[in-house]
């Protein structure tokens, strides 16, 4: 049977890395769906056996670790009672290049690099992208500039998956990397993410990325209704800031993991001349009393803006 093609993700990453990809297509994946991963052109699904190097773990496909032979196109097929959708991932696995001799001390010389920006004269933070299923335990984050490990001090302070950089100067740009230990079923793996950091003078009164909506505003919404709110973000092309919705300092998808009543949507983007306009929505399938007065915050790099739902004011006219 034919499935509707939703989109294709292009992913380039180094061999030897643990690699996850989560297949989500809200609101379809909020309800009862059958979700299966395939490697094309095979008609056999990826195994659910968690002891295999490549396996499906709930909505995720997990490579522990990647090999060069894993390059190819993977399809995630989402079926519910009425529809079928497929999301493709074009995976390119590169030779490992962590600080090898040909790189002149730089870990960042390939396409599998996150671009991030630090604001000159201010404090900024770098994100270590660590999104894995619950079956994976993550710890022992280390940060590197070039190939030298960064030690916590006045300049740098690690905090969870972030590296805070104080009083950013031009020379703080360059090649960074973060590594973390991943434990899965008693086996250990090392994750390494490479980050190319640019420093930028921040325009007075304006942050990069710039959240154009929401604006720390309230929205009147009736109890029990469905609501979709877009977060609109303008960012420079070379930046790879994380964009997400949070509540109570927790990712919305994690906070409402069990009920899936509130979900973050698929991110879309439009390329402008020297910027990209991103949109990521939040969907309230059914507004409850507990949602009123609670800030739902859109985050993009160092920028954040929230909405607060308020009960509609009665119209006495």
């Amino acid at each position: 049977d034919t499935c509707e093609d939703i989109f294709m993700h292009n992913v380039i990453i180094s061999e030897g890395q643990p690699f996850p990809f989560n297949c989500t297509y809200p609101p379809e994946t909020n309800g009862a769906v059958n979700l299966t991963w395939y490697k094309t052109p095979s008609k056999s699904p990826v195994s659910n056996n968690r002891h295999l190097r490549v396996h499906q773990d709930q909505t995720w496909i997990l490579f522990l670790p990647l090999t060069l032979e894993d390059s190819g196109i993977y399809q995630c097929v989402i079926r519910n009672a009425h529809n079928c959708y497929q999301i493709a991932v074009n995976l390119t696995v590169l030779k490992n290049h962590w600080c090898d001799s040909s790189m002149e001390g730089s870990p960042v010389n390939s396409p599998d690099v996150y671009q991030q920006i630090l604001p000159i004269g201010k404090s900024g933070s770098l994100n270590c992208h660590l999104y894995f299923p619950e079956s994976c335990a993550l710890d022992s984050i280390k940060w590197y500039k070039g190939c030298e490990e960064i030690k916590a001090g006045k300049k740098y302070s690690p905090s969870g998956a972030k590296l805070l950089v104080n009083n950013v100067a031009v020379e703080d740009g360059g090649s960074y990397a973060c590594s973390a230990r991943l434990t899965h079923l008693g086996r250990h793996f090392t994750i390494r993410n490479y980050i190319a950091v640019n420093t930028k003078e921040v325009e007075y009164g304006r942050r990069i990325p710039n959240i154009t909506y929401p604006k720390n505003n309230s929205i009147e919404v009736p109890l029990g209704s469905t609501l979709i709110v877009n977060c609109n973000i303008t960012d420079t092309k070379e930046n790879t800031n994380l964009r997400c919705w949070r509540v109570n300092n927790t990712l919305v998808d994690d906070y409402y993991k069990d009920s899936k009543r509130i979900q973050e949507g698929i991110e879309t983007n439009v390329s402008l001349r020297d910027q990209i306009r991103y949109t990521v929505n939040i969907t309230f399938l059914k507004v409850k009393m507990e949602d009123y007065g609670r800030p739902f915050t859109c985050h993009a790099g160092v920028s954040a803006a929230y909405i607060i739902l308020i009960y509609p004011v009665p119209d006495f006219r």
Epitope: E134, T183, T190, T250, D254
Partner: antibody
Framework: EVQLQQSGPELVKPGASVKMSCKAS????????MHWVKQSHGKSLEWIGF????????RYNQKFKGKATLTVNKSSSTAYMDLRSLTSEDSAVYYC?????????????WGQGTTLTVSS | DIVLTQSPASLAVSLGQRATISCKAS??????????MNWYQQKPGQPPKLLIY???NLESGIPARFSGSGSGTDFTLNIHPVEEEDAATYSC?????????FGGGAKLEIK
């Protein structure tokens, strides 16, 4: 100042259940896993498991699966441990302790402990 | 599960002298250049207190007379010079894999 404030001592009968709490303050609750550790009288420490308040994930020591259930209430920054089908073997001091998600793999702050006595 | 064996189970050390406590793991707790071994101090009626993490790193606020060393399966906690307030039970703990396990403890008495 970081504090983990645990609920008071419990005296329960065999076969009963108990729910103890650990209220966190002085830090961002969702940045740390909350672990639970058992210490029987005169014995060494035993790790029970942890709850990740950031993503709702739990991990248990196989020995305590079916015995302990870990939960949290994020809005009150409180972690809970339910112990069921209690026997005299469960009499012990139970500690909650935190570990920074992603970054560390050690327990830097501990609660004062909740003493559980199971006796008929 | 990784078993941690501490020795001696108890020791008495004179004020100002060195106390040495050993912890042996049933398998290596090293990964990627790091040792996943921590040390705690516990006094009667109190919770454990972190002293040393990752085998040799001194926790903030802990006096420099405490030091940790070792790798693989063999680890040591040293206290020098021993002070009156150091009378306590000292436990090692591995965070290499779950279930995280603790040693049986070593009780330090000051002579």
């Amino acid at each position: 100042e970081v504090q983990l404030q645990q609920s008071g001592p419990e005296l329960v009968k065999p076969g009963a259940s108990v729910k103890m709490s650990c209220k966190a303050s002085g830090y961002t609750f969702t940045d740390y896993n909350m672990h639970w550790v058992k210490q029987s009288h005169g014995k060494s420490l035993e790790w029970i498991g942890f709850f990740n308040p950031n993503n709702g994930g739990t991990r248990y020591n196989q020995k305590f699966k079916g015995k302990a259930t870990l939960t949290v209430n994020k809005s009150s920054s409180t972690a809970y441990m339910d112990l069921r089908s209690l026997t005299s073997e469960d009499s012990a001091v139970y500690y909650c302790t935190r570990q920074e998600i992603y970054y560390s793999n050690y327990f830097d702050y501990w609660g004062q402990g909740t003493t559980l006595t199971v006796s008929s | 599960d990784i078993v941690l064996t501490q020795s001696p189970a108890s020791l008495a050390v004179s004020l100002g002298q060195r106390a040495t406590i050993s912890c042996k793991a049933s398998q290596s707790v090293d990964y990627d250049g790091d040792s996943y071994m921590n040390w705690y101090q516990q006094k009667p009626g109190q919770p454990p207190k972190l002293l040393i993490y990752a085998a040799s790193n001194l926790e903030s606020g802990i006096p420099a007379r405490f030091s940790g060393s070792g790798s693989g399966t063999d680890f040591t906690l040293n206290i020098h010079p021993v002070e009156e307030e150091d009378a306590a039970t000292y436990s090692c703990q591995q965070s290499y894999e779950d279930p995280y396990t603790f040693g049986g403890g070593a009780k330090l008495e000051i002579k």
